[in-house]
């Protein structure tokens, strides 16, 4: 599999959508998992509702969502309050029993907010966290990883 | 919080119409599916019905297929539930709950339909 | 659709008494079962989801186990904010469907 990055702004909101055969994977639930160093295993971070027929419905996990169109074949995760230590490797799957079928390959970047700069009293911090939806646009930059590149790095 | 405050029970003929609301607060309403869900006096609960995040999906139990519609207005924070053509065994306590983590994390306290001539 | 079959109907205990409940599919629902409490004039609550896993802000006195077909919810030991009515869900086969409800009540 490629790896496509995704690359979000910390403090907003990440969208990252993994297309599939939607016959192929017919009857099947998904999920997200993020790869554990370079060899690791992919631990489940969330995964779409038990009930296949309702994949539509937006699951969450702290500040992950998971949504399914199963007709269209379209996985989409949402990373909501973008921080940095999101950033790293992570697997759309398709599963089936025991097992999962990798849709994609994901690499999450976390740029800088670019509000960073200015001083604390200029920021504006909403009252919760699930506010922040409302206060930035999700948006996101994705690409493939060009070949030769690695999405860890080199261990020493 | 999360906050779920269903309204617009009441007593109504059979044959006629009602119209349900559920005004949600401390949590973003629009990234969330939602569901109602009814309890006959006496009785057990029952799936009646869900929403997707955006309103672009709609399923029904059968029971009210065909005569109960569920919307949102994500703007105004709140769901619906029109019923119509309505009959005794409608009679119920309609509770509004949403869908999160699972598939139902949290409930309203409910509003009650009683259908009588 | 899937019946779910609760049982008993009323369980009599008194505070500090261990409380085992039923819950029967009429087919697999494999470990996609849930657990609510109810208590009079208010809305459910969620308590267990995926057959024994606590939702957030439940005590460990309450538990839940089992697969397939039968499950069960055991409260450890009873306190008095316990006594209510307790109903299982599965979300195994579309629609979701609840069981009748096992009302526990102090004795």
């Known amino acids: 599999h490629n790896t496509t990055v995704f690359q979000g702004v910390a403090g907003q909101s990440l969208q990252v959508s993994c297309p599939y055969d939607s016959m192929k994977h017919w009857g099947r639930r998904k999920a997200w998992c993020r790869q554990l160093g370079e060899k690791g295993p992919c631990q489940r971070v969330v995964s779409t509702h038990n009930l296949w027929l309702l994949s539509f419905l937006r699951r969450w996990n702290g500040s992950t969502a998971i949504t399914d169109d199963t007709l269209g074949g379209t996985l989409t995760i949402t990373l909501r309050n973008l921080q940095p230590h999101d950033a790293g490797l992570y697997q759309c799957q398709s599963l089936h029993g025991s097992e999962a079928d990798t849709l994609r390959k994901v690499l999450v970047e976390v740029l800088a907010d670019p509000l960073d700069h200015r001083d604390a009293g200029d920021l504006w911090f909403p009252g919760e966290s699930e506010s922040f939806e409302d206060a930035h646009v999700e948006h996101s930059i994705s690409r493939s990883l060009l070949e030769g590149e690695i999405p860890f790095p080199p261990t020493s | 919080q999360v906050q779920l405050v269903e309204s617009g029970g009441g007593v109504v003929q059979p044959g006629r119409s009602l119209r349900l609301s559920c005004a949600a607060s401390g949590f973003t309403f629009s990234s969330y599916g939602m569901h109602w869900v009814r309890q006959a006096p006496g009785k057990g609960l029952e799936w009646v019905a869900v929403?997707?995040?955006?309103?672009?999906?709609?399923y029904y139990a059968d029971s009210v297929k065909g005569r109960f519609t569920i919307s949102r207005d994500n703007s105004k924070n709140t769901l619906y539930l029109q019923m119509n053509s309505l009959r005794a065994e409608d009679t119920a306590v309609y509770y509004c709950?949403?869908?999160?983590?699972?598939?139902?994390?949290?409930w309203g306290q409910g509003t009650l339909v009683t259908v009588s001539s | 659709e899937i019946v779910l079959t609760q049982s008993p109907a009323t369980l009599s205990l008194s505070p500090g008494e261990r409380a085992t409940l039923s819950c029967r599919a009429s087919?697999?629902?494999?470990?996609?079962l849930a657990w609510y409490q109810q208590k009079p004039g208010q809305a459910p609550r969620l308590l267990i989801y995926d057959a024994s896993n606590r939702a957030t802000g439940i005590p460990a006195r309450f538990s839940g186990s089992g697969s397939g077909t039968d499950f069960t919810l055991t409260i450890s030991s009873l306190e008095p904010e316990d006594f209510a009515v307790y109903y299982c869900q599965q979300d195994s086969s579309f629609p979701p469907t609840f069981g009748g409800g096992t009302k526990v009540e102090i004795k």
């Open positions: 709950a949403r869908a999160g983590g699972h598939l139902f994390d949290y």
């Open positions: 929403i997707s995040y955006d309103g672009s999906n709609k």
């Open positions: 087919q697999s629902v494999s470990s996609y």
